[in-house]
């Protein structure tokens, strides 16, 4: 059920974790694993979860995966998934995290938490 916007605390914690990942990155993040690029204009939390869940054995993003589960604990309807993924486009996890961070910072500044 659609309902109130997320409180800023949860979004702030997610942004802080993404900042931490980008700042502490030394070797290629998750060994250069590739993930599906997502449509950042709709359902960003569930879309990001669906993309990152396919990366296993990468401790650097485990906390991010968990936090995204917090925002998206129940599945969106099957029909919505087709609109979440950018068709046939894969990018490195590091770039995915950077793009997601930029987008979430923008949402936070604008007060658009949903």
């Amino acid at each position: 059920s659609p309902s109130p916007v997320p409180p800023s605390t949860a979004l702030k914690e997610l942004i802080e974790e993404l900042v931490n990942i980008t700042q502490n990155q030394k070797a290629p993040l998750c060994n250069g694993s590739m993930v599906w690029s997502i449509n950042l204009t709709a359902g960003v939390y569930c879309a990001a979860l669906e993309s990152l869940i396919n990366v296993s054995g990468c401790s650097a993003i485990e906390k991010t995966q968990r936090m995204l589960n917090g925002f998206c604990p129940h599945k969106v309807s099957a029909g919505q998934f087709s609109s979440l993924r950018v068709r046939d486009t894969k990018i490195e996890v590091a770039q995915f995290v950077k793009d997601l961070l930029v987008h979430l910072k923008k949402l936070f500044r604008e007060g658009q938490f949903n």
């Epitope: 997320p6 949860a10 968990r66 589960n69 917090g70 925002f71 599945k75």
Partner: antibody, heavy 118, light 111 residues
Framework: EVQLVESGGGLVQPGGSLRLSCAAS????????MSWVRQAPGKGLEWVAS???????YYPDSVKGRFTISRDNAKNSLYLQMNSLRAEDTAVYYC????????????WGQGTLVTVSS | DIQMTQSPSSLSASVGDRVTITCKAS??????????VHWYQQKPGKAPKLLIY???NLESGVPSRFSGSGSGTDFTLTISSLQPEDFATYYC?????????FGGGTKVEIK
Amino acid sequence: EVQLVESGGGLVQPGGSLRLSCAASGFTFSSYAMSWVRQAPGKGLEWVASISSGDTTYYPDSVKGRFTISRDNAKNSLYLQMNSLRAEDTAVYYCARNEGYYFGLTLWGQGTLVTVSS
Amino acid sequence: DIQMTQSPSSLSASVGDRVTITCKASESVDHFGWSLVHWYQQKPGKAPKLLIYRASNLESGVPSRFSGSGSGTDFTLTISSLQPEDFATYYCQQSNEDPWTFGGGTKVEIK
């Protein structure tokens, strides 16, 4: 210690209301979705409500419009407001940490008993 | 709603036995290659405890004698060598579709 502790259960008449609370400790409460699951005496488990870290709420049809899940991150607390209670709502109500559809309900409280009877 | 049917509803076994519990979903609970079924253990008067997530992944701290398998509609929880502390009721649960639903439970008793 990582734990969840429920309170607020008791005896209530049909049509009455009750508010359950769940106190979380030992983990970053605000980062997790949370759920309520109930178990009627001698029966199986039934999911009752969930709330995301962003306050999106989810309910099964059996309680929609009667039950309201909410959270207070500042108090590390989860709540379940139950209105228009029926005899079939009699159950032990468990608070659970919900790590999403990929990981399930990873931490449970000890439960609180709600009895709806005249 | 997706119905989760467990069998048997109860069984008697001895310490050291290999125990298998099955769970059948009324429709597929697979999602992009993942099976969204989880298994829980509940002892009398206690809260449930997560054992297996996503059909076959062992939750942290759970003994390796527990394992899960299956996909689509048919799932299995196996205890390779039953221990005294394993006598309990076991539930499967699907999270592929709202409402999340549980199986009716399988009670594992001492023979």
